[in-house]
């Protein structure tokens, strides 16, 4: 229904802590370099306005939309140009076109610093002091560096986050608390980062009926026995809320999925058996508990697929009549009926089945022609459960660092033209995979295995398109998002690429390394690799790996030497020199 | 492919009317978004108003907000534009355009893979 003032009714269903929140959230995507204090000060200024127009709707621009009110705000703000750029030529539009290209300049990969945890001792005092500047300062440093994460999910994040210090700050050992537990978090929220962004780009460049493909089959995989009509409702609906945080309306997003999680909840008797245990919570982990729950129990007594879909005579009169509901009951039925494949694989055979059906419904014997399809989609099956099965072999092999290595040699050998940086990143995101499907149950890895990949390539795709340097990426990332993983994967080593010349400096180390955390270490070791390989894209696994032992070997005996500078400035160009003639 | 044919453009007074309308042939089950946009001599195409074929959900530039209303008549596969109270800063091309996909970016004409030939609004007195 309409509302006299769209501010004042958001204020009410979110309620004050969560509308500041999300209006933080909105700031801070937006305009990414803003202070906390800079944007914590409109997101008064917002409130302030809002409990005005909830005590009088009536009152001036009161009536405006939120996106008018928030694009005035952000466009009042001083030196707007100096700090972005053209961004700011966005103020001389109107709204909606004004919204609509501040989206267009958020930046996926913003030149802020990496976000530092402080040390437990510190970080308790400054959360005991303020809890909600503290937890407002999480907001925002999450939001500036990741500009799609979803809103509602990231006030969930901070709840968790809160839960934790309040916990751990309280313990004697607040160190070994804290750390386990705030990791845990950092890891889930990367990953929920990548996996929305992956859903803004389906509707980016795609729009919402890919989008709302996808959801009907991920929505099938968990609720089997939901009927059809229930599915496309969900569909509908998640396409909707999706649709808003994309869109940057943070508000509505987050009220709109709280009033699906609210459905849900009131409908578990035609949606799934599993969701009482994520009712009975309040509502961020509610809504949260929702969107992982387990799959439901598959019903016993379902069809062969083919009954419907191959078998009937009425196929092509059927597929004529309504192509989307009759493509999208396809979907469902065969959805329900594999939650052991990925998202991307079951759309892949959604988008065969309507080729074939294309093709087959104008010729003259339909049934002669479509007969065969379901036989047609073994080898579509077959790539990703053998792109699992030799993964996660190399993997338990290997080990998570090892297998990143594998992953970034095999990726700078396609694209060599890609940055290091950008390299590096994408290995060791691609090798977290194996930690985190390849020990999971048999049937549980492939959807795992091949709908994290995509989210991490569709990063990949992201960072490339904005100084695009391989032809092979460019192709990969210009088809359709679900034949992405497949193309990546097919992709073999760039026969145009012209090699590197060996810059003795881009090998050269120094002692400091020795004191660096571990991660930082792999990375300084990973970047030395990707250069190895872009010197020589043919080198074979088995001198990489006399190298890369080498170079171990060299860090371990200087950062135990006493004088590790010395140590550095001469066994340095020796390991240059051996490195130089083992890839000869 | 889908086909629009725009028509009911012309010369009219400020604070006058006019109704454009916009044939659609073809899949035209496809356009799941249709929108108007207007280009102005020397200036760049602009939005103007877009529907939601399946839902009719509608959104407006703020400056035609409350003059002008967008509509669609899904038996005659017809999209519609009321223009009310028109300004000389009206002046310009209209343009029927059609999105299949429903793109998250309604503003942006390169979402529209499907666009009429245009039909002018003149406003002057």
């Known amino acids: 229904e309409a509302h006299k003032s769209e501010i004042a009714h958001r204020y009410n269903d979110l309620g004050e802590q969560h509308f500041k929140g999300l209006v933080l959230i909105a700031f801070s995507q937006y305009l990414q370099k803003c202070s906390y204090d800079e944007h914590a000060k409109l997101v008064q200024e917002v409130t302030d306005f809002a409990k005005t127009c909830v005590a009088d709707e009536s009152a001036a621009n009161c009536d405006k939309s939120l996106h008018t009110l928030f694009g005035d705000k952000l466009c009042a703000i001083p030196n707007l140009r100096e700090n972005y750029g053209e961004l700011a030529d966005c103020c001389t539009k109107q709204e909606p076109e004004r919204n609509e290209c501040f989206l267009q300049h958020k930046d996926d990969n913003p030149s802020l610093p990496p976000f530092e945890r402080p040390e437990a001792e510190a970080m308790c005092t400054s959360f005991k002091e303020n809890p909600t500047t503290f937890m407002g300062h999480y907001l925002h440093e999450v939001a500036r560096r990741h500009p799609y994460f979803y809103a509602p999910e990231l006030l969930y994040y901070a709840e968790q986050y809160n839960e934790i210090l309040t916990q751990c700050c309280a313990e004697a050992d607040k160190e070994s608390c804290l750390t386990p537990k705030l990791d845990g978090v950092k890891e889930k929220a990367l990953v929920s980062s990548v996996r929305q962004r992956m859903k803004c780009s389906s509707m980016q460049k795609f729009g919402e009926r890919a989008f709302k493909a996808w959801a009907v089959a991920r929505l099938s995989q968990t609720f089997p026995n939901a009927d059809f009509a229930e599915i496309t409702k969900l569909a509908t609906d998640l396409t909707k809320v999706n649709k808003e945080c994309c869109h940057g309306d943070l508000l509505e997003c987050a009220d709109d999925r709280a009033e699906l999680a609210k459905y849900m909840c009131e409908n578990q008797a035609t949606i799934s058996s599993k969701l009482q245990t994520c009712c009975d919570k309040p509502l961020l982990k509610k809504a949260h508990c929702l969107s992982e729950v387990e799959h439901d129990t598959m019903p016993a007594d379902l069809p062969a697929i083919a009954a419907d879909f191959v078998e009937d005579q009425e196929v092509c009169k059927n597929y004529a009549e309504a192509k989307d509901v009759f493509l999208g009951t396809f979907l469902y039925e065969y959805s329900r009926r594999h939650p052991d494949y990925s998202v991307s694989l079951l759309l892949r055979l959604a988008k065969k089945y309507e080729a074939t059906l294309e093709k087959c419904c104008a010729e003259a014997n339909p049934p002669a022609c479509y007969g065969t399809v379901l036989a047609e989609f073994q080898p579509l099956v077959e790539e990703p459960k053998n792109l699992v099965k030799t993964n996660c072999d190399l993997y338990e092999k290997l080990g998570e660092y090892g297998f990143q290595n594998a992953i970034l040699v095999r990726y700078t050998q396609k694209a060599p033209q890609v940055s290091t940086p950008t390299l590096v990143e994408a290995a060791r995101n691609l090798g977290r995979v194996g930690t985190k499907c390849c020990t999971l149950p048999e049937d549980q890895r492939l959807p795992c295995v091949e709908d994290y990949l995509s989210a991490i390539l569709n990063r990949v795709c992201l960072l490339h398109e904005k100084t695009p340097v391989s032809e092979h990426v460019t192709k990969c990332c210009s088809g359709s998002l679900v034949e992405r993983r497949p193309c990546f994967s097919a992709l073999t080593v760039d026969e145009t690429y012209v090699p590197k010349e060996f810059k003795a400096e881009t090998f050269t180390f120094h002692s400091d390394i020795c004191t660096l955390p571990e991660k930082e270490k792999q990375i300084k070791k990973q970047t030395a690799l990707a250069e190895l390989v872009k010197h020589k894209p043919k080198a074979t696994a088995e001198q990489l790996k006399t190298v890369m032992d080498d170079f171990a070997q060299f860090l371990d005996t200087c950062c135990k030497a006493a004088d590790k500078d010395t140590c550095f400035s001469t066994e340095g160009p020796n390991l240059v020199t051996r490195c130089k003639d083992a890839l000869a | 492919e889908v086909q629009l044919v725009e028509s009911g453009g012309g010369l009219v007074q400020p604070g006058g009317s006019l109704r454009l309308s916009c044939a659609a042939s073809?899949?035209?089950?496809?356009?799941?978004?249709m929108g108007w946009f207007r280009q102005a001599p020397g200036k760049e195409r602009e939005f103007v108003s877009a529907?939601?074929?399946?839902?009719?959900?509608?959104v407006y530039l703020d400056s035609v907000k409350g003059r002008f209303t967008i509509s669609r008549d899904n038996a005659k596969n017809t999209l519609y534009l009321q223009m009310n109270s028109l300004r000389a800063e009206d002046t310009a091309v209209y343009y029927c355009?059609?999105?299949?996909?429903?793109?998250?970016?309604?503003?942006?004409?390169?979402?529209?893979?499907?666009w009429g030939q245009g039909t002018q609004v003149t406003v002057s007195s």
């Open positions: 355009a059609a999105d299949p996909d429903s793109r998250l970016y309604y503003t942006v004409p390169q979402n529209y893979d499907y």
């Open positions: 073809g899949r035209t089950d496809s356009a799941y978004r």
């Open positions: 529907i939601n074929w399946s839902d009719g959900r509608t």
